[in-house]
């Protein structure tokens, strides 16, 4: 039975040109995390495999950085980065858990939400 839950940063905003950390956390389960995929509307951004390390999609390698932890750092943000992001946790023995984050990239400097996950 899948007892775990994914906690995410929820709806966050950041400034154009800035950076943001996407974070998910799996709790309430003893299942072993074997791999975490990060996707943006069906497009793979990155994979963090417990044994193989990180795979960053070549299309994003110049502005996506692995971590911290199982999270993902998006850099040089553009308005086109606005949208849904998904963390997909592959676990043993539970199976797959999915978390959702909505990122809004703002033209102005009004980026109050999720400030603790921003990189200055």
């Amino acid at each position: 039975m899948m007892t775990g839950t994914i906690e995410t940063t929820g709806n966050i905003s950041a400034e154009k040109g800035g950076s943001i950390i996407l974070q998910c956390h799996l709790s309430s389960t003893t299942a072993q995390v074997t791999q975490v995929n990060w996707e943006q509307q069906d497009q793979l951004l990155a994979i963090c495999n417990a044994d193989l390390g990180w795979h960053i999609s070549p299309s994003f390698k110049d502005r996506v950085a692995p971590g911290p932890g199982l999270g993902l750092t998006l850099q040089s943000l553009t308005v086109n980065d606005t949208g849904e992001y998904f963390c997909i946790y592959h676990t043993y023995p539970d199976g797959t858990y999915t978390g959702r984050i909505f990122l809004e990239v703002l033209e102005s400097s009004v980026a109050e939400h999720g400030a603790r996950f921003q990189i200055p």
Partner: antibody, heavy 119, light 107 residues
């Protein structure tokens, strides 16, 4: 056109080391991880390890961990695989292979380098 | 390590035949499976990744299916250039491992 061109065949004595090179062209070298895979005569393919050419970070198959070193030279877009303490069972064709867009599989392969270990 | 088995180990077929190769994996790898074609003296060529996604430039007669532990490669209508050895590979954990191969030859 993506190309991975490997160094030529090698004959080595048991206990020696071999260093195989793989020169990449036709794409941005630092954007794609590189794998090394070998194939002994009549055997299945065997994965040895992978490297991120951008950071130099690598991961190895535990079976080879103490004997294999994978490195890159970003300036020349070349990956290297060095295998030490060679034994006859290391006689194989060694391949470099570029990691694909969407995971840890390999989408382009070098032509292979035959390494023969014989006394 | 994740163990990979393939069946059959070899098969004889004619041009135009439908050919099916099976790959069985020792544990759940979701859809993280690739298929490669290798001809004698040549490098492997990627056919399929993520169990069912056709690699660039690969003819549509090749298809892949399956998830979890059981996977299939199908060639809908065998062509002369398809006579080769086919390998499955999981791309899910360390070490990445390959199946023993299935040799497809001319009947």
């Amino acid at each position: 056109e993506v190309q991975l061109v490997q160094s030529g065949a090698e004959v080595k004595k048991p206990g020696a080391s071999v260093k195989v090179s793989c020169k990449a062209s036709g794409y941005t070298f630092t954007n794609y991880y590189m794998h090394w895979v070998r194939q002994a005569p009549g055997q299945r393919l065997e994965w040895m390890g992978r490297i991120d050419p951008d950071s130099g970070g690598s991961k190895y198959n535990e079976k080879f961990k103490s004997r294999v070193t994978i490195t890159v030279d970003k300036l020349s877009s070349t990956a290297y695989m060095e295998l030490s303490s060679l034994r006859s069972e290391d006689t194989a064709v060694y391949y470099c292979a570029r990691e694909g867009h969407y995971g840890f599989y390999s989408d382009y392969w070098g032509q292979g380098t035959t390494v023969t270990v014989s006394s | 390590d994740i163990q990979m088995t393939q069946s059959p180990s070899s098969l004889s077929a004619s041009v135009g035949d439908r050919v099916t190769i099976t790959c069985r994996v020792s544990e759940n790898i979701y859809s993280y499976l690739a298929w490669y074609q290798q001809k004698p003296g040549k490098s492997p060529k990627l056919l399929i990744y993520n169990a069912k996604t056709l690699a660039e430039g690969v003819p549509s007669r090749f298809s892949g299916s399956g998830s979890g532990t059981d996977f299939t490669l199908t060639i809908s209508s065998l062509q002369p250039e398809d006579f080769a050895t086919y390998y499955c590979q999981h791309h899910y954990g360390n070490p990445l491992t390959f199946g023993p191969g299935t040799k497809v030859d001319i009947k």
